[in-house]
């Protein structure tokens, strides 16, 4: 398959509610109409799939119902949001883009976005 350049931010800090968003941008060589986006997490040299979606250009990304990811697309950019993150989920999140149709198939893998997640301090008990 032919390599494709994929850009994503180097670092993102998750919100106090455990939500992290970042943009994944790819340099499409042709006029792809069907694109597959996969988010991979790399931690301790282990790579696991976080979520994946295949979408038609101009349409919304559709992740599985139980997915922790949501996203929107605009041109050659995909805006990804990962929810429900905790401190233990801190790691490198890699954006993988595949142009599925029409052929030829193109594959692009970003350098990864380091997402830092800090668990919020528990609220102290208060007496009223």
């Amino acid at each position: 398959c032919k390599a494709m350049h994929v850009a994503q931010p180097a670092v993102v800090l998750a919100s106090s509610r455990g939500i992290a968003s970042f943009v994944c941008e790819y340099a499409s060589p042709g006029k792809a109409t069907e694109v597959r986006v996969t988010v991979l997490r790399q931690a301790d040299s282990q790579v696991t799939e976080v979520c994946a979606a295949t979408y038609m250009m101009g349409n919304e990304l559709t992740f599985l119902d139980d997915s922790i990811c949501t996203g929107t697309s605009s041109g050659n950019q995909v805006n990804l949001t990962i929810q429900g993150l905790r401190a233990m989920d801190t790691g490198l999140y890699i954006c993988k883009v595949e142009l599925m149709y029409p052929p030829p198939y193109y594959l692009g893998i970003g350098n990864g976005t380091q997402i830092y997640v800090i668990d919020p301090e528990p609220c102290p008990d208060s007496d009223f």
């Epitope: 032919k2 042709g30 006029k31 069907e34 295949t54 595949e98 599925m100 149709y101 029409p102 052929p103």
Partner: antibody, heavy 114, light 111 residues
Amino acid sequence: EVQLLESGGGLVQPGGSLRLSCAASGFTFSDYYMSWVRQAPGKGLEWVSGISWSSRDKGYADSVKGRFTISRDNSKNTLYLQMNSLRAEDTAVYYCTTDLARYWGQGTLVTVSS
Amino acid sequence: QSVLTQPPSASGTPGQRVTISCTGSSSNIGAGYDVHWYQQLPGTAPKLLIYGNDNRPSGVPDRFSGSKSGTSASLAISGLRSEDEADYYCAVWDDSLNGVVFGGGTKLTVL
């Protein structure tokens, strides 16, 4: 190593049917668009039909529309071409190809003759 | 008649440089799709020679090169050798046909 092995070719009478198969190995079959390309004796290459990874998109050359049907089984890594109402002009070597003809099988000969 | 136009024949002497053209339209090459080139030696299946306009698969000598401009593409073979005698085809995706289109092929003769 990528391997594409076509089968199902042979001699058939005009108006008859044949089903070609292509067994694929050495790559992630379910990721790729697949095509059938044919070459009549002494002629050039002609794209016959193609199918997207999910089978959602299928395309056919005008010369075979309504007569040929392409399908795939990703669980079996196999591509198919059902050929009906065969004509003498369908006589050719039929090649199975991956993606935009990146890899080719060795081909299977289809002869339509009475 | 093919959607992509190639000269039916080309020739050259050993060591020479030859160029084969492939002319398309706004629904294929002009639409921004990548052009691919194939070599078919006598009695064998075609083999990918150039993909994505100008990329060589591993094992293809750097004597072969491809380029694309507007609605046309070309294949150049430098330092021509006798084993280069073969049929050469270009191919590209075509929007209006929703499929792959091939050129009519060019028979290269090494004199």
